[in-house]
């Protein structure tokens, strides 16, 4: 068993069970759940004499941890005296110590109810310059209470002289006020009113509420990205739980496989959102082969605030497959932005919708943050399409004027990737690439070519690819500008872009 520090509990009798003429009385201290031996128990008896006896440690059956009791017998004016039991456990650390201070006996008492009330917002729903918190400690048997205010668990320096106590019948109530600046209140800190009474602690906490009521908790389970699956060959799936109210209860996420086979070790991350809610993500590495062969993975979510467990399942998408078509083009120079250009990539007619898009320059993959790619949208047919946008600088294109848009998709053959290159200055004859305004929509074509063939290869228009007037009879998608290049000795190919 690993090292475990003890839990310490005072042992006292009920005051009504101690005869009023008793000249001596015994109290005790229990140290339990520690490992290994030993613990050292000492007593502070104040001005009184006392004899102590520490019983041999016993082993707790289930855990193998130890428990021991130390007894203190005192005589004299014990009724008004407080006693401290000091437990040290050097195996935990050389300075590990727990002190418990208590009286000889415990009276029957009604514990207090602790409630924090806060001052209202103004009529417009805004916070005033100062916020008052009122701690109501009510309904307890009269006796000494200590009130402490905490800010994010740290004791605050507060003037407690304002605390007032009233008695109603046999029970007492006390209230303490804390004034905070608006800045402190809006800083999202937690304020706690902590009450110590009869050796017990009672508390209530409050903080600025979230700006909006969180919706019900939602859970989502992602499929692995094609890039992770086919290129990196280390696919992961992520279970995402959003809109949790922060609380003492933790979110429990359990992974399983429909086949019953064991799952890998998952990693977990918790993030507090600006609206006060909590987002929890758990990422599970999955086997490439397991995924491709159709294994179903399940994420089960439980939490005290969830009425019922939530289950999310994910597996490889079924249905027809179609490889993506990739078209890359550069926007023309725009007034006032000579040192920057936007490259665009249209990827379309792929199925299923899972796709990864990357941009490369100088054979190096650019960071994902450099480009912006839309979510897959359905085409009018049965496939999907995405657009990806990349901003490039003059320094980059002057270093090497070739940028590659690459799509990773399971239906692309032979290696699950399709890519097209695009240049900022493709050197088109006709010169409209350098135009100072957005060009009219045109079709680019070679003089000799009569039909529009399917794209067979290549990436950017060749200098022999001429810009011509748009032709309504030209086949192909009407919303795109298409360039046909006559390749020597090969099938012609298309380039889609702006001339």
């Amino acid at each position: 068993a690993s090292t475990q520090s003890p839990s310490v509990f005072p042992l006292t009798r009920c005051c009504k069970n101690i005869p009023s003429n008793a000249t001596s009385v015994t109290l005790g201290c229990l140290a339990t759940g520690y490992f290994p031996e030993p613990v050292m128990v000492t007593w502070d008896t104040g001005s009184l004499n006392g004899t102590t006896m520490t019983l041999p440690a016993t082993t707790l059956t289930l855990s193998g941890h130890y428990a021991t009791i130390s007894l203190l017998t005192v005589s004299g004016a014990w009724a008004k005296q407080m006693f401290t039991c000091r437990v040290a456990h050097t195996p935990s650390s050389t300075d590990w110590v727990d002190n418990k201070t208590f009286s000889v006996c415990s009276r029957d008492f009604t514990p207090p109810t602790v409630k924090i009330l806060q001052s209202s917002c103004d009529g417009g729903g805004h916070f005033p310059p100062t916020i008052q918190l009122l701690c109501l400690v009510s309904g307890y048997t009269p006796g000494t209470i200590n009130i402490t205010w905490l800010e994010d668990g740290q004791v605050m320096d507060v003037d407690l002289s304002t605390a007032s106590t009233t008695q109603e019948g046999e029970l007492a109530s006390t209230q303490s006020e804390l004034t905070l600046s608006q800045k402190h209140w809006l800083s999202d800190r937690t304020y706690t009113c902590q009450v110590t009474y009869q050796g017990h602690t009672f508390e209530d906490s409050t903080k600025k509420c979230a700006d909006s009521n969180p919706r019900g908790v939602s859970a989502y389970l992602s499929r692995p990205s094609p890039f992770d699956l086919f290129i990196r060959k280390s696919p992961t799936i992520t279970c995402l739980v959003v809109d949790l109210a922060p609380s003492k209860g933790t979110v429990n996420l359990t992974w399983s496989r429909a086949s019953g086979k064991p799952v890998n070790h998952s990693t977990r991350k918790e993030e507090k959102q600006r609206n006060g809610t909590l987002t929890v993500t758990s990422t599970l590495p999955v086997g490439t082969r397991d995924w491709i062969e159709g294994e179903t993975y399940q994420c089960r979510v439980t939490h005290p605030h969830l009425p019922r467990a939530l289950m999310r399942s994910t597996t490889k998408t079924s249905g027809p497959r179609a490889a993506p078509e990739v078209y890359a083009f550069a926007t023309p120079e725009w007034p006032g932005s000579r040192d920057k250009r936007t490259l665009a990539c249209l990827i379309q007619n792929f199925m299923p919708e899972d796709i990864s898009v990357q941009w490369l320059h100088n054979e190096v993959q650019l960071p994902d943050a450099r480009h912006s790619t839309t979510q897959p949208r359905k085409t009018k047919g049965s496939g999907f399409f995405v657009f990806s946008r990349l901003e490039v600088t003059r320094a980059e294109w002057e270093q090497k004027d070739e940028f590659i848009c690459r799509a990773v998709h399971e239906a692309a053959s032979p290696s699950q990737t399709v890519q097209r290159a695009v240049s900022v200055n493709p050197g088109l004859a006709g010169g409209s690439a350098q135009s100072q305004r957005a060009p009219d929509r045109v079709l680019c074509h070679s003089g000799q070519q009569q039909g529009l063939p399917r794209a067979a290869g290549g990436s950017v228009p060749h200098p022999r690819c001429h810009c011509g007037a748009g032709r309504a009879d030209w086949p192909g998608p009407p919303e795109l500008d298409v360039c046909v290049e006559e390749a020597e000795g090969e099938a012609p190919w298309t380039w889609t872009g702006l001339c």
């Epitope: 919706r215 989502y220 089960r300 439980t302 005290p304 009425p307 019922r308 467990a309 289950m311």
Partner: antibody, heavy 119, light 110 residues
Framework: QVQLVESGGGLVQPGGSLRLSCAAS????????MTWVRQAPGKGLEYVSI???????WYANWASGRFTISRDNSKNTVYLQIDSLRAEDTATYYC?????????????WGRGTLVTVSS | DIQMTQSPSSVSASVGDRVTITCQAS??????LAWYQQKPGQPPKLLIY???TLASGVPSRFSGSGSGTEYALTISSLQPEDFATYYC????????????FGGGTKVEIK
């Protein structure tokens, strides 16, 4: 096998109270969220309340205040306390077990106990 | 709260017929639509969960489909024992929800 047996129903006067019990056997009660569903004679199913594995509970809007769900895992029993009974509470009350893996509905139902509210 | 609207409220059909019952949710359901069958004097029985997964022991003539807000239960070839009332349930509420059951569809003999 999994069994849920409801008891505690019967004829009660308006304004009275009842405590329905659901004895569970054949599975580990503490692993399952538990639900009470009721069905008025000739009508559809109506969700009343759910208690999760942590012992926290939720109620349908109309049930809040008069209905109290609780569970005692050591006794393998789930309870539904109904106060201030009204004629419209007349129904068969079903105790039901939510699937363990979650968000997949109710996989086992008791046979129900009939509550009749009438003067 | 998500409301579940089931239609039709009743349907008359013959043995061997294909019967489809629909259930519309007032908001999208991410996961967890269930279908139940109930016969007179009996508790409901789980048929389908997670939109389309057949519960244990349920004949393959029952199938569930749909996503978002539109769901359907289809009985491909109605059998004598299938004459009953069917309920859909939004089984995925992660917060307080009022009635999570549809109003029910009674499948009667024509």
């Amino acid at each position: 096998q999994v069994q849920l047996v409801e008891s505690g129903g019967g004829l009660v006067q308006p304004g009275g109270s009842l405590r329905l019990s659901c004895a569970a056997s054949g599975f580990t009660l503490s692993n399952h969220d538990m639900t009470w569903v009721r069905q008025a004679p000739g009508k559809g199913l109506e969700y009343v309340s759910i208690i999760n594995t942590y012992g926290n509970h939720w109620y349908a809007n109309w049930a809040s205040g008069r209905f109290t769900i609780s569970r005692d895992n050591s006794k393998n029993t789930v309870y539904l306390q109904i106060d201030s009974l009204r004629a419209e509470d007349t129904a068969t009350y079903y105790c039901a077990r939510e699937t363990h893996h979650g968000s997949s509905g109710i996989d086992h139902w008791g046979r129900g106990t009939l509550v009749t509210v009438s003067s | 709260d998500i409301q579940m609207t089931q239609s039709p409220s009743s349907v008359s059909a013959s043995v061997g017929d294909r019967v489809t019952i629909t259930c519309q949710a007032s908001e999208s359901i991410y996961s967890g639509l269930a279908w139940y069958q109930q016969k007179p004097g009996q508790p409901p029985k789980l048929l389908i969960y997670d939109h389309s997964t057949l519960a244990s022991g349920v004949p393959s003539r029952f199938s569930g489909s749909g996503s978002g807000t539109e769901y359907a239960l289809t009985i491909s070839s109605l059998q004598p024992e299938d004459f009953a009332t069917y309920y859909c349930q939004h089984a995925d509420y992660a917060h307080h929800s009022d009635n999570v059951f549809g109003g029910g569809t009674k499948v009667e003999i024509k």
